[in-house]
């Protein structure tokens, strides 16, 4: 579709002749019929099939044309045809004289042909002007011609149909060749594609306007690079969306379950030490003076047995008090009135006399202390054994029962059950006291995660497009992988073929 | 247990303002994202705005974007709702989950009210 | 976006009555579709998601199918506790969306 536009300039009739060889009266005035048709080596009368057109009178004899864009008498003359421009045509300019009306000449009697030119050729779809000049031995005509595009149509035949849109169904601008020029933002073979953020993740990110990057199931951020931990995870994070990695310290399917009690909680009170021991489970081993599950009772003042040689002891509100035996003296009893000569040294000790005979030592053999020698040692009294070992009084020596997972003279030593890598299948191991736990991947259970779980959600097949399958933190969930170029909770759908976009 | 307490609610007049804020407990704030949705009187359920675990990158739904901005402080466990150029339309529940743009939300605070009325 | 539409929009039914509610997305959501209960006064609480995986904590009874656009929420045999309403939502696309709810009361 396009336009053949004639631009008539200069007519030239200085003798004022009709074409009969009669002259006009008083003048010849002027207008012009335009034919236009296909090629034809001779021209010849019949329909004009690329279209006609006729002006008013537009002088008398000799006279220039001057441009005008409006109303009656519009110059340059437009043909417009609605096919492929074929590239060639026939074009008859004929001028004709008019006694009658000037502004439709072509319906009044009595018109007569003053002259007729005929131009065969070729013309190519441009904007530049092809100027010509007839002569014959009566009249001149000066014009110029070419064909240009109707708007929206382009290309070399204004066969190519392209209107600029910026909607739903596409965002371009035409180029003078009638391909399509997307605006900024904008990609695809009809310009309705958009161009995500920059960095956008083009797997698990997608985007229904510029600029913008909206993240596909199970991923987050900015680029949509970070996958988002399961929905149940509590203590965890994800290296492949729905997972739920445990944080340092967190174990259980969930990440829920507490390997660092003391850490997060320190229930333990009084400066005594705690000791983990399963998920949610501790010990608390106390300072002397205290007990209780927290060591959060403080114990009597006079458990501690602070009276010597034999003097009983009296609780009182913030302190206490010795009564001491006959003999004994002093804060704690500790000072004495006897001497060697009333043998106060028992189970075989032996006394020494001190400060010229006023006081004495006792000397005692193993196993036994005290002033006077009275107690049996009890190496056990300083809690010698570290991590909630057992203290055991093995006659002049001691010796510690370790708990599991505890080793060393004192138990002050930890046994790590994860060195022997006892975890099957990738599992994570976590050091207990009361042994190794192992924190199964998915797919696996068991205690050491021996047991391969064959019912799970992979076992169906549920991944496209050769996805892998990953089954996420229960039997019935799943995850798939996807290969290059696939996206989808299940992997089925391309890339390059994202789903739909509901505007 | 997981525990998200939302506070700050209350009444105000159109064009006013409003922070609305979220105490998170019982999981690792920093690892997860999280969202606000909203629910006007007697109507149902609509998403408001989404913020990323690590880098706080936020994303705001249509009807309030240019108005709400979604912040967080994973040092305290926090999670916010700042409320601009408040209208009538913006009465609602408005409650705290645990959950993005593109997952269920997992867990939700109890709610709290914002009432624009002049 | 995303139409999310649930039928019925309520529903009365008995304790022990086997309940049936649907959920119809405007296109393929490809399974990303999570179920809500929510009680009077109360926050909602996540049944299911990815259309049919129980989230922690929840009954046996209740249980979710579907592909494509269309989803079901089953509730094997009603307890008193179980009259709320529920919400569907889909996650598959930016913005998320929620449907108008069903409203489960006693008969």
């Known amino acids: 579709s396009g336009i053949f536009q004639l631009r008539l300039q200069e007519f030239a009739n200085e003798r004022g002749m009709l074409a009969n060889g009669r002259p006009c009266e008083p003048g010849c005035r002027t207008f012009f019929r335009i034919c236009l048709k296909h090629y034809q080596a001779t021209f010849s009368e019949g329909p004009c099939t690329f279209g006609n057109v006729s002006t008013p009178v537009l002088g008398t004899n000799s006279f220039v044309i001057r441009d005008k864009n409006s109303g009656s008498g519009r110059n340059p003359l437009q043909l417009p045809f609605n096919f492929t421009w074929p590239g060639t045509f026939s074009l008859n300019i004929q001028a004709w004289h008019t006694p009658g009306d000037d502004l439709r000449p072509e319906t009044s009697p009595g018109n007569s042909l003053i002259s007729q030119i005929i131009i065969q050729g070729s013309l190519a779809v441009g904007k530049n002007w092809k100027s010509d000049e007839q002569n014959n031995t009566l009249t001149r005509l000066r014009y110029s011609y070419r064909v240009v595009c109707s708007d929206n149509y382009y290309g070399d035949s204004c066969s190519r149909l392209c209107k600029k849109r910026d909607d739903h169904f596409g965002h371009y601008e035409c180029q003078p060749d009638g391909s399509l020029s997307c605006l900024p933002g904008w990609t695809g073979k009809y310009c309705d594609q958009p161009i995500c953020l920059s960095g956008c993740h083009e797997q698990n990110g997608y985007c229904s306007k510029p600029d913008e990057c909206n993240c596909r199931p199970g991923w987050q951020g900015p680029l949509c690079n970070e996958c988002i931990p399961h929905n149940g995870c509590r203590h965890g994070t994800c290296t492949i969306p729905w997972q739920c990695a445990c944080d340092e310290g967190w174990g259980g399917l969930f990440c829920d379950q507490d390997l660092n009690y003391c850490t997060h909680h320190s229930p333990c009170k009084n400066g005594s030490t705690c000791s983990n021991s399963g998920p949610r489970g501790y010990t608390c081993t106390c300072l002397p003076g205290y007990t209780g599950e927290h060591c959060e009772l403080e114990l009597s003042k006079c458990a501690s047995n602070p009276c010597r040689n034999g003097g009983s002891c009296k609780d009182h509100e913030n302190s206490y008090h010795c009564l001491c035996p006959p003999g004994y003296y002093g804060q704690h009893c500790e000072h004495s009135t006897l001497t060697c000569a009333d043998s106060p040294c028992f189970n075989g000790g032996s006394c020494r006399e001190r400060n010229q005979g006023a006081s004495y030592a006792c000397e005692c053999p193993p196993n036994f202390t005290g002033s006077n020698c009275e107690k049996k040692v009890d190496r056990c009294t300083s809690n010698p054994c570290a991590n909630g070992g057992q203290c055991l009084n093995r006659g002049p020596s001691r010796t510690c029962r370790c708990r599991p997972g505890f080793t060393g003279t004192h138990c002050e030593l930890h046994i790590s059950d994860c060195a022997r890598s006892p975890c099957a299948h990738g599992g994570t191991c976590h050091d207990l006291e009361n042994g190794p736990v192992c924190t199964c991947p998915a797919g696996f259970s068991g205690r050491r995660c021996e047991v391969r779980i064959t019912n799970d959600a992979c076992a169906s097949g549920p991944c496209f497009n050769g996805a892998t399958c990953y089954t996420g933190l229960s039997p019935n969930n799943f995850v798939c992988n996807c290969p290059y170029g696939f996206v989808g909770s299940r992997c089925e759908f391309p890339v390059g073929l994202p789903p739909s976009f509901p505007w | 247990e997981v525990q998200l307490v939302e506070s700050g609610g209350g009444l105000v007049q159109p064009g006013g303002s409003l922070r609305l804020s979220c105490a998170a407990s019982?999981?690792?704030?920093?690892?997860?994202?999280m969202s606000w949705v909203r629910q006007a009187p007697g109507k149902g359920l609509e998403w408001v705005a989404s913020?990323?675990?690590?880098?706080?990158?936020?994303t705001i739904g249509d009807s309030v974007k240019g108005r709400f901005t979604i912040s967080r402080d994973n040092a305290k466990n926090s999670l916010y709702l700042q409320m601009n150029s408040l209208r009538a339309e913006d009465t609602a529940v408005y409650y705290c989950a645990r959950g993005y743009y593109n997952s269920p939300f997992a867990f939700w605070g109890q709610g709290t009210l914002v009432t624009v009325s002049s | 976006d995303i139409q999310m539409t649930q039928s019925p929009s309520s529903l009365s039914a008995s304790v022990g009555d086997r309940v049936t509610i649907t959920c119809r997305a405007s296109q393929e959501i490809y399974r990303n579709l999570a179920w809500y209960q929510q009680k009077p006064g109360k926050s909602p609480k996540l049944l299911i998601f990815d259309t049919s995986v129980l989230a922690d904590g929840v009954p046996s009874r209740f249980s979710g199918s579907g592909s494509g656009t269309d989803s079901t929420l089953t509730i094997s045999s009603l307890q008193p506790e179980d009259f709320a309403t529920y919400y569907c939502?889909?996650?598959?696309?930016?913005?998320?969306?929620f449907g108008q709810g069903t409203k489960l009361e006693i008969k």
């Open positions: 019982g999981f690792t704030f920093g690892n997860f994202p």
């Open positions: 913020i990323s675990s690590s880098d706080s990158w936020a």
């Open positions: 939502q889909q996650y598959t696309y930016y913005p998320p969306t």
